[in-house]
Interface confidence: low
Amino acid sequence: KVFGRCELAAAMKRHGLDNYRGYSLGNWVCAAKFESNFNTQATNRNTDGSTDYGILQINSRWWCNDGRTPGSRNLCNIPCSALLSSDITASVNCAKKIVSDGNGMNAWVAWRNRCKGTDVQAWIRGCRL
């Protein structure tokens, strides 16, 4: 599923991401834009052999199990395939664990490079939330 901007903002808000660990909803929508272009089925292979999955590009080395990443930790205790669902519940729940891990949203390279320090509220402007 490819979400619309405001559609995703509403879904993320419903799942409790707004101001989760101090990160406003705009940060999460911005991260999703530059990680996956709002596509729940986005996948990208990394040079270390791991793969990033889903709308927030969650990594199989640490967070989920795809059965194919050597030394996977699966800290979210989920199959990576769950992160490709049009239902973003699994991605959100895992993201909450990631953002609580110590580095906050710096764990997402795209957020660090494209969203951090910008007017992230622009990503939810005009949305009926």
């Epitope: 596509n39 089925q41 996948t43 795809d66 194919r68 050597p70």
Partner: antibody, heavy 116, light 107 residues
Framework: QVQLQESGAEVMKPGASVKISCKAT????????IEWVKQRPGHGLEWIGE????????YYNEKFKGKATFTADTSSNTAYMQLSSLTSEDSAVYYC?????????WGQGTTLTVSS | DIELTQSPATLSVTPGDSVSLSCRAS??????LHWYQQKPHESPRLLIK???QRQSGIPSRFSGSGSGTDFTLSINSVETEDFGMYFC?????????FGGGTKLEIK
């Protein structure tokens, strides 16, 4: 139960292209990688590459880039591999398998013969 | 690419014998090594995953061991249905690679 059903044997002329199909049943097709493997007598098993049907992501063994092209149709739960510019070296049995790192489920194989 | 070398190429045994098949990787692959059996005109069948985990439905006479670069598939008291080709495969890195195979034949 999980099953992978491949298309039937093909006899093709050198220079032609062929498209092999692999229909999956018994699991959520879009969220598991489909792998393609080549087997020639005396050459063992060779990994050609893989596709994740739900996203269309593909990864190819460098050796088969330009030779193989993967596609998938999630509406029919079918993966396809097209082989182009066929030569006698492409004569082999081609398998699809469900990728979990290891390959627990395999198709029955499609025999391709390239002959003038 | 990781090269997998299987030995011996052919193993001639009598039913009831116990045998060991070897698979050696060109670099360390942890336990990311899987074993398959293949009979003529059939697809490969997964026997052992991750070096030592027997796949569901595989008889207990099959066992796997090893880590790093050296791996062994053992068959305790070979039965006639066990004859065929055995392949190892690594999932430590891409491209996935297979060993050249060991043929288990009746003496």
């Amino acid at each position: 139960q999980v099953q992978l059903q491949e298309s039937g044997a093909e006899v093709m002329k050198p220079g032609a292209s062929v498209k092999i199909s692999c229909k999956a049943t018994g699991y959520t097709f879009s969220t598991y990688w489909i792998e393609w493997v080549k087997q020639r007598p005396g050459h063992g098993l060779e990994w050609i590459g893989e596709i994740l049907p739900g996203s269309g992501s593909t990864y190819y063994n460098e050796k088969f880039k330009g030779k193989a092209t993967f596609t998938a149709d999630t509406s029919s739960n079918t993966a396809y591999m097209q082989l182009s510019s066929l030569t006698s070296e492409d004569s082999a049995v081609y398998y699809c398998a469900r990728g979990d790192g290891y390959y627990c489920y395999w198709g029955q194989g499609t025999t391709l013969t390239v002959s003038s | 690419d990781i090269e997998l070398t299987q030995s011996p190429a052919t193993l001639s045994v009598t039913p009831g014998d116990s045998v060991s098949l070897s698979c050696r990787a060109s670099q360390s692959i942890s336990n990311n090594l899987h074993w398959y059996q293949q009979k003529p005109h059939e697809s490969p069948r997964l026997l052992i995953k991750y070096a030592s985990q027997r796949q569901s439905g595989i008889p207990s006479r099959f066992s796997g061991s090893g880590s790093g670069t050296d791996f062994t598939l053992s068959i305790n008291s070979v039965e006639t249905e066990d004859f065929g080709m055995y392949f190892c495969q690594q999932s430590n890195s891409w491209p996935r690679t297979f060993g050249g195979g060991t043929k288990l034949e009746i003496k």
